[in-house]
């Protein structure tokens, strides 16, 4: 019986230009963490196998880092990163874990106007 | 250089056995899945079994279950499959392959004849 | 089990033309599709994995995209030696699947 769960970050936002961890972790199981596979919307970005350490994908080796642990940090985000990420844990005996986050990249620009002109 | 290298193919009657070996090196065997698929002469590719780097777990195509074992010896960085009752439809050439992340078959050995004929 | 159907079976085609192949998987498979090149007598060769990377040492006129159950592998400038039959594969599943082939020949 599967009785892990995942927590992750959940819904996040950050700025135009700037980096962005995304992280998940697993608990309440002792089962085997074999392999984690980071994907955005059916494109694979990364994956941090047990044996064989850090696979990034080509199209995304210049904005993504592998680390901390086995999150994920985006670099140069763009307002095109907004979306969902998932985490999908492979595990040894229980199966397949799957944590999901939404990112939310803001114009900085926006971000900035936003705060420079707020009425006192 | 990462390379693989099938052997034990052969002529073999229906009903026989056949044991083929795949012999790696160039890479840590212990850390890489490792598969079988076979050709069928003139025909395509068909995924035959597959093993994981601790020989933990294995699949097989409905075509060969309880009839193929896969197996793998890490200390001889040597992946096997043990052919049982074989069959004329079982004539093809087997290949082995390494996949990594369990998701790309990235090197595949030459490739070893087997055939299924009285 | 998953059903993986390229099209066309075979096309010919001449030095330079842009060459499209296309696959389609009877369930959304995400990005589990690889693309293989096979030659006679010879093994396949891994050209595209998880449906748009590029393998290394690939020449990079070889691209793919697609997800969930249509796939393209697109050869921009057909050389001498891409003539080769092609095979797309799913590893959503086991059973793993293979598409037909498609064989490209020298028009």
């Known amino acids: 019986m599967m009785t892990g769960t995942i927590e992750t970050t959940g819904n996040i936002s950050a700025e135009k230009g700037g980096s962005i961890i995304l992280q998940c972790h697993l608990s309440s199981t002792t089962a085997q963490v074999t392999q984690v596979n980071w994907e955005q919307q059916d494109q694979l970005l990364a994956i941090c196998n047990a044996d064989l350490g850090w696979h990034i994908s080509p199209s995304f080796k210049d904005r993504v880092a592998p680390g901390p642990g086995l999150g994920l940090t985006l670099q140069s985000l763009t307002v095109n990163d907004t979306g969902e990420y998932f985490c999908i844990y492979h595990t040894y005996p229980d199966g397949t874990y799957t944590g999901r986050i939404f990112l939310e990249v803001l114009e900085s620009s926006v971000a900035e106007h936003g705060a420079r002109f707020q009425i006192p | 250089e990462v390379q693989l290298l099938e052997s034990g193919g052969g002529l073999v009657q229906p009903g026989g056995s056949l044991r083929l070996s795949c012999a790696a090196s160039g890479f840590t065997f212990s850390s890489y899945s490792m598969h079988w698929v076979r050709q069928a002469p003139g025909k395509g590719l068909e995924w035959v079994s597959a093993i994981n780097s601790n020989a933990g777990s294995s699949s097989y195509a409905d075509s060969v279950k309880g009839r193929f074992t896969i197996s793998r010896d890490n200390s001889k960085n040597t992946l096997y499959l043990q052919m049982n009752s074989l069959r004329a439809e079982d004539t093809a050439v087997y290949y082995c392959?390494?996949?990594?992340?369990?998701?790309?078959?990235?090197?595949w050995g030459q490739g070893t004849l087997v055939t299924v004929s009285s | 089990d998953i059903q993986m159907t390229q099209s066309p079976s075979s096309l010919s085609a001449s030095v330079g033309d842009r060459v499209t192949i296309t696959c389609r998987a009877s369930q959304s498979i995400s990005y589990y599709l690889n693309w293989y090149q096979q030659k006679p007598g010879k093994a396949p060769k891994l050209l595209i994995y998880?449906?748009?990377s590029l393998q290394s040492g690939v020449p990079s006129r070889f691209s793919g995209s697609g997800s969930g159950t249509d796939f393209t592998l697109t050869i921009s400038s057909l050389q001498p030696e891409d003539f080769a039959t092609y095979y797309c594969?799913?590893?959503?599943?086991?059973?793993?699947?293979f598409g037909g082939g498609t064989k490209v020949e020298i028009k």
């Open positions: 998880a449906a748009s």
């Open positions: 392959a390494r996949v990594p992340y369990g998701v790309w078959m990235d090197y």
């Open positions: 594969q799913q590893s959503y599943s086991t059973p793993l699947t």
